[in-house]
């Protein structure tokens, strides 16, 4: 692959990564595909510092991240280990709530209005954040 040395136009550089913040909403899978076509992935939050950076840019708006449990266990889209990694769930979340009446539970994670995380129905049209790393050869993101 080709190495990226600077962020594309309209992306924000932070700590050797580039971030793109949507201003419209998509279902989680559509947002995931959008980022993949940009040779990026839905944002993977690996630290409190990155959490605060993303939170600052998205404001108090529900926003998808690259975390889901559609195949069972919670997984980050770039393969970052979930169990040992950073987490910022709201109290009593994730709860895989079935009471929404939309069928199934809640398999996709998003930032809530206060920045903490919640699991929700993946079809909800939330905003999203794409992330790509600088100085790293582009490669195909892992399949879900």
């Amino acid at each position: 692959g080709s190495e990226r040395t600077c962020c594309p136009v309209n992306w924000v550089e932070h700590e050797r990564s580039c971030y793109w913040f949507s201003r419209s909403g998509k279902a989680w899978a559509d947002a995931d595909n959008y980022c993949r076509l940009e040779d990026a992935h839905l944002v993977v939050v690996t630290s409190w510092e990155e959490q605060k950076f993303v939170q600052h840019h998205i404001g108090p708006v529900n926003t998808w991240m690259g975390l889901h449990d559609q195949n069972g266990p919670w997984k980050w889209v770039d393969g970052t280990d979930y169990e040992t990694g950073f987490k910022n769930w709201r109290p009593e979340q994730p709860d895989d709530w079935y009471g929404h009446g939309l069928g199934g539970g809640e398999d996709c994670a998003h930032f809530t209005d206060d920045g903490r995380w919640n699991d929700d129905v993946c079809q909800r049209p939330y905003r999203w954040v794409c992330e790509t790393e600088l100085d790293k050869a582009s490669q195909e993101p892992p399949l879900l």
Epitope: G1, P8, L37, E38, P125, S138, Q139, E140
Partner: antibody
């Protein structure tokens, strides 16, 4: 000048294979997602496939999934479409198209097209 | 998959006329809507992206509007070179899909 030039179109029998090429010039090829779009004789436009700038991600129309493969060689500034198990309904002019800025911004540059005819 | 429809499928107009073409998506696509012009035997030409943004080099008589599911392409004063087929296309999600086209011919 930004330019796309398709080649490889031909007449082929049903079940046969063909590889189309699209040579790009005048822009930083690896920075843009690229698509194939086709148009059957007398019909409208049908999107076929898209590939990201690095070639790492690609998506297909249901009508070609499992039969067609999109790829690119950024060192040669060339886009490809490998077409297998061809059917009569694949007969069309095939255009390659460049995405405007991002992969969801529409196609701002089109090639002149190459004709694929599937017939026995 | 998102289905796109256009109306009318064809229309006859005269030079100087104001022409409006509508495009509808089967679900909300925000403003991920593009318009193309295709003259007979030629490759499509990009006119408008993001529902209302005019592509560089496209005459200002072309304009687009709409959001969600309903969109419009307007040609304020039809010129001889505008007689062609016009397609809308959604780029909200793959598979990207085109409308069936609207043919604008001379009255």
């Amino acid at each position: 000048e930004v330019q796309l030039l398709e080649s490889g179109g031909d007449m082929v029998q049903p079940g046969g294979s063909l590889r189309l090429s699209c040579a790009a010039s005048g822009f930083t090829f690896s920075s843009y997602a690229m698509s194939w779009v086709r148009q059957a004789p007398g019909k409208g436009l049908e999107w076929v496939s898209v590939i990201s700038g690095s070639g790492g991600s690609s998506f297909y129309a249901d009508s070609v999934k499992g039969r067609f493969t999109i790829s690119r060689d950024n060192s040669k500034n060339t886009l490809y479409l490998q077409m297998n198990s061809l059917r009569a309904e694949d007969t069309a002019v095939y255009y390659c198209a460049k995405d405007r800025v991002r992969a969801h911004d529409g196609f701002d540059i089109w090639g002149q097209g190459t004709m694929v005819t599937v017939s026995s | 998959d998102i289905q796109m429809t256009q109306s009318p499928s064809s229309l006859s107009a005269s030079v100087g006329d104001r022409v409006t073409i509508t495009c509808r998506a089967s679900q909300s696509i925000s403003n991920y809507l593009n318009w193309y012009q295709q003259q007979t035997g030629k490759a499509p030409k990009f006119l408008i992206y993001a529902a209302s943004s005019l592509q560089s080099g496209v005459p200002s008589r072309f304009s687009g509007s709409g959001s969600g599911t309903d969109f419009t392409l307007t040609i304020s004063s039809l010129q001889p070179e505008d007689f062609a087929t016009y397609y809308c296309q959604q780029s909200y999600s793959t598979p990207f899909t085109f409308g069936p086209g609207t043919k604008v011919d001379i009255k």
